[in-house]
């Protein structure tokens, strides 16, 4: 029985050219986390494997940094980075837990005026 829950940063915004931390946290379960995958739509960004450590996809290696923790830092943001991001926790024996984050990358002038998504 899967008892765990994923807490995420929810809906977030960031400035074009800046960076953002995508963060998920798995709670309410004693299951062992074997691997966390970070995906954007159907594209793999990075993997953190419990035994083998961090693995960044080739197409993102210059703009993605591992951490903090099991989170992921996106750098040099562009408007094209706007969209859904998923943290996929592979656990034993529970199975798979998925969290969703929506990121909007704003033009710097808009971001300066304080436009923000509210975290539900």
């Amino acid at each position: 029985m899967m008892t765990g829950t994923i807490e995420t940063t929810g809906n977030i915004s960031a400035e074009k050219g800046g960076s953002i931390i995508l963060q998920c946290h798995l709670s309410s379960t004693t299951a062992q986390v074997t691997q966390v995958n970070w995906e954007q739509q159907d594209q793999l960004l990075a993997i953190c494997n419990a035994d083998l450590g961090w693995h960044i996809s080739p197409s993102f290696k210059d703009r993605v940094a591992p951490g903090p923790g099991l989170g992921l830092t996106l750098q040099s943001l562009t408007v094209n980075d706007t969209g859904e991001y998923f943290c996929i926790y592979h656990t034993y024996p529970d199975g798979t837990y998925t969290g969703r984050i929506f990121l909007e990358v704003l033009e710097s002038s808009v971001a300066e005026h304080g436009a923000r998504f509210q975290i539900p």
């Epitope: 074997t34 691997q35 793999l44 993997i47 494997n49 035994d51 083998l52 450590g53 693995h55 960044i56 996809s57 080739p58 197409s59 290696k61 592979h90 034993y92």
Partner: antibody, heavy 123, light 109 residues
Framework: QVQLQESGPGLVKPSQTLSLTCTVS??????????WGWIRQPPGKGLEWIGS???????YYNPSLKSRVTISVDTSKNQFSLKLSSVTAADTAVYYC???????????????WGQGTMVTVSS | EIVLTQSPGTLSLSPGERATLSCRAS???????LAWYQQKPGQAPRLLIY???SRATGIPDRFSGSGSGTDFTLTISRLEPEDFAVYYC??????????FGGGTKVEIK
């Protein structure tokens, strides 16, 4: 589809270093999800995993061979290589390269293999 | 390391018969990490089953895998002439390291 091909000397002298290369065709070695591995099989015996490498250079090795093994990758040539030092007759085997799905979790396996190359250690 | 013991060492059967191959692990293995391979003389191994029970691409449905924990089974429902080969199980953990079983030879009776 992805294909693998081993190459290297078929004869190595005792105490020397065995060197093999695996060329990946039909796909990029710079995969976000796959490692690339080496497995060997002495004549008439079973399979023994040697070690595997990620495109970034991250490796994991069989502890029983780790002190003698170096696996490296050359993404510009779409190749990865094996070096096994201080060889003896016991290292005589068919050496295979294969695609390692260790990061795929529920599909962990060696799903694509090269044809293998026989290496004999003898003076 | 996890030792995989395959039995029997040799299985002598006729075409059309059912083959049952056993793989026993010295300690528990996640079924997600258990694979089976077929190897014919002079050829590289070919992946048959991954995740203990999922058939790899292009593998006929007469091949099936089952099991969990320490006991796993490969079943060939009706042996075809091309199925006579050596079969290996393999566990794909990182720590302790991945290992192969010693193999089961399926030969024509």
């Amino acid at each position: 589809q992805v294909q693998l091909q081993e190459s290297g000397p078929g004869l190595v002298k005792p105490s020397q270093t065995l060197s093999l290369t695996c060329t990946v065709s039909g796909g990029s070695i710079e995969s976000g999800v796959y490692y690339w591995g080496w497995i060997r099989q002495p004549p008439g015996k079973g399979l023994e995993w040697i070690g595997s490498i990620y495109y970034s250079g991250s490796t994991y090795y069989n502890p029983s061979l780790k002190s003698r093994v170096t696996i490296s990758v050359d993404t510009s040539k779409n190749q990865f290589s094996l070096k096994l030092s201080s060889v003896t007759a016991a290292d005589t085997a068919v050496y295979y390269c294969a695609r390692d799905g260790v990061l795929t979790l529920n599909k962990r396996s060696f799903d694509i293999w090269g044809q293998g190359t026989m290496v004999t250690v003898s003076s | 390391e996890i030792v995989l013991t395959q039995s029997p060492g040799t299985l002598s059967l006729s075409p059309g018969e059912r083959a049952t191959l056993s793989c026993r692990a010295s300690q528990s293995v996640s079924s997600s990490y258990l694979a089976w391979y077929q190897q014919k003389p002079g050829q590289a191994p070919r992946l048959l089953i991954y995740g203990a029970s999922s058939r790899a691409t292009g593998i006929p449905d007469r091949f099936s895998g089952s099991g969990s924990g320490t006991d796993f089974t490969l079943t060939i429902s009706r042996l075809e002439p091309e199925d006579f080969a050596v079969y290996y199980c393999q566990q794909h953990t990182v720590r302790p390291p991945l290992t192969f079983g010693g193999g089961t030879k399926v030969e024509i009776k």
